[in-house]
Interface confidence: medium
């Protein structure tokens, strides 16, 4: 496993008052079967609303690396390969669960955290506001 | 707190051999700050690769309810509102962490699990295989 410099203020895992705490087994069970190994592979490049993937790294978080999608264009790619600004590339977001070391640098003490991530982009028809 | 009919086989949280176990504080911190507030969208309907959302519920898992995207069409919606089969609607998938009660019905013992979810759909140019 990984050796983490231990914070002397780390909570005692036997402490009955350690707030709202449960035991979590980190032997991660992967429910993702091999039925679809390809997944979203090169969709980021082939999409009409392509995106770049940015590495978001935080050693105090598990998972420590999360890839964030940023749409490449405001518009969408048309059949000629040009950007069509009559359509919009927008990020698809999802809230996910992560574990954050708390207090920092404690090897076996975490807090649940919800974060919002952009997973990819999709091309949408814009909402047009008509001025009276 | 909650009263749960306790499984007699629940692990002892003080057991030093309880495999790769950490303490997790369940006070969920919400990192969705004002810089990135959750803005509700109807992208699932306005997308050129629209999708439906299906409810996946598992009471032994947290989050218990996960909404799965299923693309409505094989092709994408063109400017005329028709399905264009020269393009493909594909799901954007993401691996997420969930907590599973393990053994089942134990109030304070969980296992991390990775699952693959479809968050939305995007429109991609198909890969054309030319036969020699």
């Amino acid at each position: 496993g990984i050796t983490i410099p231990r914070n002397p203020g780390c909570p005692n895992s036997e402490d009955k008052n350690f707030p709202r705490t449960v035991m979590v087994n980190l032997n991660i069970h992967n429910r993702n079967t091999n039925t679809n190994p390809k997944r979203s592979s090169d969709y980021y490049n082939r999409s009409t609303s392509p995106w770049n993937l940015h590495r978001n790294e935080d050693p105090e978080r598990y998972p420590s690396v999360i890839w964030e999608a940023k749409c490449r264009h405001l518009g969408c790619i048309n059949a000629d390969g040009n950007v069509d600004y009559h359509m919009n590339s927008v990020p698809i977001q999802q809230e996910i669960l992560v574990l954050r070391r708390e207090p920092p640098h404690c090897p076996n003490s975490f807090r649940l955290e919800k974060i919002l991530v952009s997973v990819g982009c999709t091309c949408v028809t814009p909402i047009v506001h008509h001025v009276a | 707190g909650i009263t749960i009919p306790r499984n007699p086989g629940c692990p002892n949280s003080e057991d030093k051999n309880f495999p790769r176990t950490v303490m997790v504080n369940l006070n969920i911190h919400n990192r969705n700050t004002n810089t990135n507030p959750k803005r509700s969208s109807d992208y699932y309907n306005r997308s050129t690769s629209p999708w439906n959302l299906h409810r996946n519920e598992d009471p032994e898992r947290y989050p218990s309810v996960i909404w799965e995207a299923k693309c409505r069409h094989l092709g994408c919606i063109n400017a005329d509102g028709n399905v264009d089969y020269h393009m493909n609607s594909v799901p954007i998938q993401q691996e997420i962490l969930v907590l599973r009660r393990e053994p089942p019905h134990c109030p304070n013992s969980f296992r991390l699990e990775k699952i693959l979810v479809s968050v939305g759909c995007t429109c991609v140019t198909p890969i054309v295989h030319h036969v020699a």
């Epitope: - | 909650i2 969208s41 699932y44 309810v65």
Partner: antibody, heavy 126, light 107 residues
Framework: EVQLVQSGAEVKKPGESLKISCKAS????????ISWVRQAPGQGLEWMGG????????DYAQKFQGRVTITADESTTTAYMELSGLTSDDTAVYYC???????????????????WGQGTTVTVSS | EIVLTQSPDFQSVTPKEKVTITCRAS??????LHWYQQKPDQSPKLLIK???HSISGVPSRFSGSGSGTDFTLTINGLEAEDAGTYYC?????????FGQGTKVDIK
């Protein structure tokens, strides 16, 4: 269809405690949260606190901290709200409400109150 | 805590008229704002969730809009059965808070 059925009206004296139940049926009790909201006569809605049933963790409004305890019993799919040190200001209708407690996915709500109990009228008077 | 301020406090409306109720949050709350209707001696009922999303079984004359700090509930073509008090509710941050309510009655 989710239904929340609350216990009956109560008359209490100042200084006493109150415990109201909220029996849930339909849907998986563990999949959602239960919040308690009260409404004093002629007044608006006031959130007191809630419980995430999956973990049994609670959150309380600062105003009620130390005086309110929210619990839940999975075996009977019932949530409880206990309020101690009652005064005449606690005279109100108390509602339990379901919080879908779902993670955000761009559309479906996470913390609206989509189902409500019928309300429990509590009168505190000497 | 996040304060929600509704306006107006009271509105007397003729049937078939359009009703607009606004709710302003003391800080940005994204779209995490919901609208409820409460009729006398009844429990509140969810009308609109996440600022603009309709609820199954709620008449289409009810609609919501806005994001950030300013939100609007619109009733297009008020009907007699719509009399009651309307509340906005934010779930962006704890504690959950409600607006003070807007009472709508029929002329």
């Amino acid at each position: 269809e989710v239904q929340l059925v609350q216990s009956g009206a109560e008359v209490k004296k100042p200084g006493e405690s109150l415990k109201i139940s909220c029996k849930a049926s339909g849907g998986s009790f563990r999949s959602y949260g239960i919040s308690w909201v009260r409404q004093a006569p002629g007044q608006g809605l006031e959130w007191m606190g809630g419980i995430t049933t999956f973990f049994g963790i609670t959150d309380y409004a600062q105003k009620f901290q130390g005086r309110v305890t929210i619990t839940a019993d999975e075996s009977t799919t019932t949530a409880y709200m206990e309020l101690s040190g009652l005064t005449s200001d606690d005279t109100a209708v108390y509602y339990c409400a379901r919080d879908p407690n779902e993670f955000w996915n761009g559309y479906y709500a996470t913390h609206d109150f989509d189902y409500w109990g019928q309300g429990t009228t509590v009168t505190v008077s000497s | 805590e996040i304060v929600l301020t509704q306006s107006p406090d009271f509105q007397s409306v003729t049937p078939k008229e359009k009703v607009t109720i606004t709710c302003r949050a003391s800080q940005i709350i994204g779209s995490e704002l919901h609208w409820y209707q409460q009729k006398p001696d009844q429990s509140p009922k969810l009308l609109i969730k996440y600022a603009s999303h309709s609820i199954s079984g709620v008449p289409s004359r009810f609609s919501g809009s806005g994001s950030g700090t300013d939100f609007t509930l619109t009733i297009n073509g008020l009907e007699a059965e719509d009399a009651g008090t309307y509340y906005c509710h934010q779930s962006y941050d704890l504690p959950h808070t409600f607006g003070q309510g807007t009472k709508v009655d029929i002329k």
